[in-house]
């Protein structure tokens, strides 16, 4: 009752290894790292056989099969490349995840390299079995903005792709008679979120209550250049409208809001987010130059009364933009305090424009991003949102445009978007 000699399977071993095996002797068949015991098409870690009374083994020796991690999981906004020939997915094979450049980048500059582990799982040194995250790239237009810009009053036509974050927000309240329709601008922050001014999305009421417009009445256009031709643009409805809870309709303090889009928009050369600044109280430094784009009034001689009486006819067809310097806070406060009327330039606002006038943002540009190029990151950052201006016509002498200081609201914005600030941009101790 001696059993025949055993040959270990390829890439495997039998224990105990003996010259002879007799009745009741048991052996354990196991495989090398990266291989699994395969018996009757069932994978297992080990397999035991026994020498029977009649001198035969209780079972045939199983085979050792290389571990297969199978097809890796798909990455949203990402691609997979196989480093191993024939697109192998077996033990020690390597794959590399990358993001759809130039519109997405990998969070935390992860290598994206995953190796098929002995356990049959794709593993990354940092993330383990978790997939990487592709975040939208921000503040890098496919078309570089010219360094010198003529003086949306005193502005010039924007080329398509110059302001890929620019959104046109159309609000139409059909429940009212006559129909209420107005529009403003906004800035794309991610594939799903638009930043704008709260006054653009406040229901137009006669009292001072602040109630957001119904999300059903909001349409957002992205990648739009000429308002007469919306065919090339992406239009989206709103899933949520979020006004800053402390927006004050009387002095426009906290004039900031967000729109969550119904569906994430596909990013491309004409649709790309702008970057948010760091949380800081100073905001943009005086005399820094920023750019603002919008479809607002581009005729400096049009008064607010004329705009109201003529509806939307005075609006620009083609997206306009203008370059404006940030005005020292004290100078702006003084310029408004000297006017009749209850004007209040708070710490949550900054001003931009020229003392001599002629260049300004105007009605219909509301909510648009005042962007400044950050030399350090080489990206465009939204520092302001077009908020309000004096009673005189746009572009008047010593009437500066007033902008919401976005850097005061970064913590609030990230939280509304459901992203902890530290994930997206770790706070740097200064």
């Amino acid at each position: 009752n001696e059993c025949p000699e055993l040959q270990p399977p390829v890439h495997g071993k039998i224990e105990p290894s003996q010259a002879k095996y007799f009745f009741k002797d048991q052996v354990l068949v196991s495989c090398d790292t990266g291989y699994k015991v395969l018996k009757d098409n069932v994978e297992m870690d080990t397999f035991q056989i026994e020498c029977l009374k009649d001198g035969t083994w209780s079972n045939k020796i199983p085979t050792c099969k290389i571990v297969d991690c199978r097809a890796p999981g798909e990455l949203e906004h990402g691609l997979i490349t196989f480093s191993t020939r024939n697109n192998l997915t077996t033990y020690k094979s390597e794959i590399k995840y990358s993001c759809q450049e130039p519109y997405y980048k990998m969070l935390n500059n992860n290598t994206g390299i995953y190796t098929c582990s002995a356990q049959g799982v794709w593993m990354n040194k940092v993330l383990g079995r978790s997939l990487p995250t592709c975040l939208p790239e921000c503040g890098q237009p496919s078309r570089s903005l010219p360094s010198l810009v003529k003086r949306i009053i005193g502005g010039r036509n924007a080329e398509p792709g110059l302001f890929p974050w620019q959104a046109l927000i159309v609000v139409e309240d059909t429940s009212r008679v006559p129909n209420d329709k107005w529009f403003g601008s906004g800035a794309l922050l991610s594939a799903s979120w638009i930043l704008t001014a709260a006054h653009v999305l406040r229901s137009q009421r006669r009292d001072t209550t602040v109630i957001p417009v119904s999300k059903e009445h909001v349409t957002v256009y992205l990648g739009l250049h000429d308002v007469r031709d919306k065919s090339g643009a992406v239009n989206s409805s709103a899933a949520r409208v979020v006004l800053h809870p402390d927006f004050n309709i009387q002095n426009y303090n906290h004039d900031i809001a967000l729109v969550q889009l119904q569906e994430p928009v596909p990013l491309g050369p004409h649709v790309m987010p702008v970057c948010l600044p760091r949380l800081e109280p100073e905001g943009p430094a005086p005399h820094m130059l920023g750019l603002v784009a919008g479809w607002g009034i581009s005729n400096p001689n049009v008064t607010v009364d004329e705009i109201i009486s003529s509806g939307t006819r005075t609006l620009s067809d083609v997206l306009q933009y203008v370059k404006l310097p940030v005005v020292p806070h004290a100078e702006c406060k003084t310029s408004y305090e000297s006017r009749s009327g209850n004007y209040s330039v708070t710490e949550n606002m900054f001003c931009a424009g020229y003392y001599e006038g002629g260049k300004d943002t105007c009605l219909g540009d509301s909510g648009g991003a005042f962007v400044i190029f950050d030399d350090l990151s080489q990206r465009w950052v939204v520092q302001g949102l077009v908020s309000w201006g004096g009673p005189e016509e746009c572009g008047s002498k010593q009437v500066y445009g007033v902008y919401t200081k976005v850097s005061n609201y970064v913590d609030w914005v990230w939280e509304q978007m459901g992203l902890p600030q530290s994930v997206v941009e770790p706070q740097v101790e200064r």
Epitope: L279, P281, D411, E429
Partner: antibody, heavy 120, light 107 residues
Framework: EVQLQQPGAELVKPGASVKMSCKAS????????ITWVKQRPGQGLEWIGD????????NYNEKFKSKATLTVDTSSSTAYMQLSSLTSEDSAVYYC?????????????WGQGTLVTVSS | DIVMTQSQKFMSTSVGDRVSITCKAS??????VAWYQQKPGQSPKLLIS???NRYTGVPDRFTGSGSGTDFTLTISNMQSEDVADYFC?????????FGAGTKLELK
Amino acid sequence: EVQLQQPGAELVKPGASVKMSCKASGYTFTSYWITWVKQRPGQGLEWIGDIYPGSGSTNYNEKFKSKATLTVDTSSSTAYMQLSSLTSEDSAVYYCARRRYYATAWFAYWGQGTLVTVSS
Amino acid sequence: DIVMTQSQKFMSTSVGDRVSITCKASQNVGTAVAWYQQKPGQSPKLLISSASNRYTGVPDRFTGSGSGTDFTLTISNMQSEDVADYFCQQYNSYPLTFGAGTKLELK
């Protein structure tokens, strides 16, 4: 978890000064204003002033301008308030507090308060 | 300075009652009002911000309302643990100011 730690009590003599601390943890200290509030026994709350640790900028209640000096030590994430020329009117509990959001001055996080007793 | 007036210094109530504490601002503060609860020997605890936004973890029996100059904190179903001082605060402009407080006690 955001925490503000303050010493429990300080006993000081009239005419002297006291410097109380507020040690912050659980967040980036330099990103949020720290506010100081006074409460006399059985009385309401009075805003003294606030300080932005990132730059050292301060805002004071006019009433406390010559009484309180606000400072920070960013290396230890600690805010300080010094009260000078103390009288019995300064006997109170002093709280430090932190805003929830940078731009809105309501206070979600409070220290336990330091009881200052001015007595000879 | 903006004066916040809480006209009721004391309010006596019973468990299960609906209680409304009022606060009046001397000028328009929009919705920039917060409400705090303070129990003896403890620091104030935020209940409401932006006049009506209940803070995380605050029971839904606490409701804030109002805008402009008139604000109300309502406790819809008074509980024994709600016995405390309640303060309103405006943060529309500096200097930040608090109401004198309303002491809520059980009958």
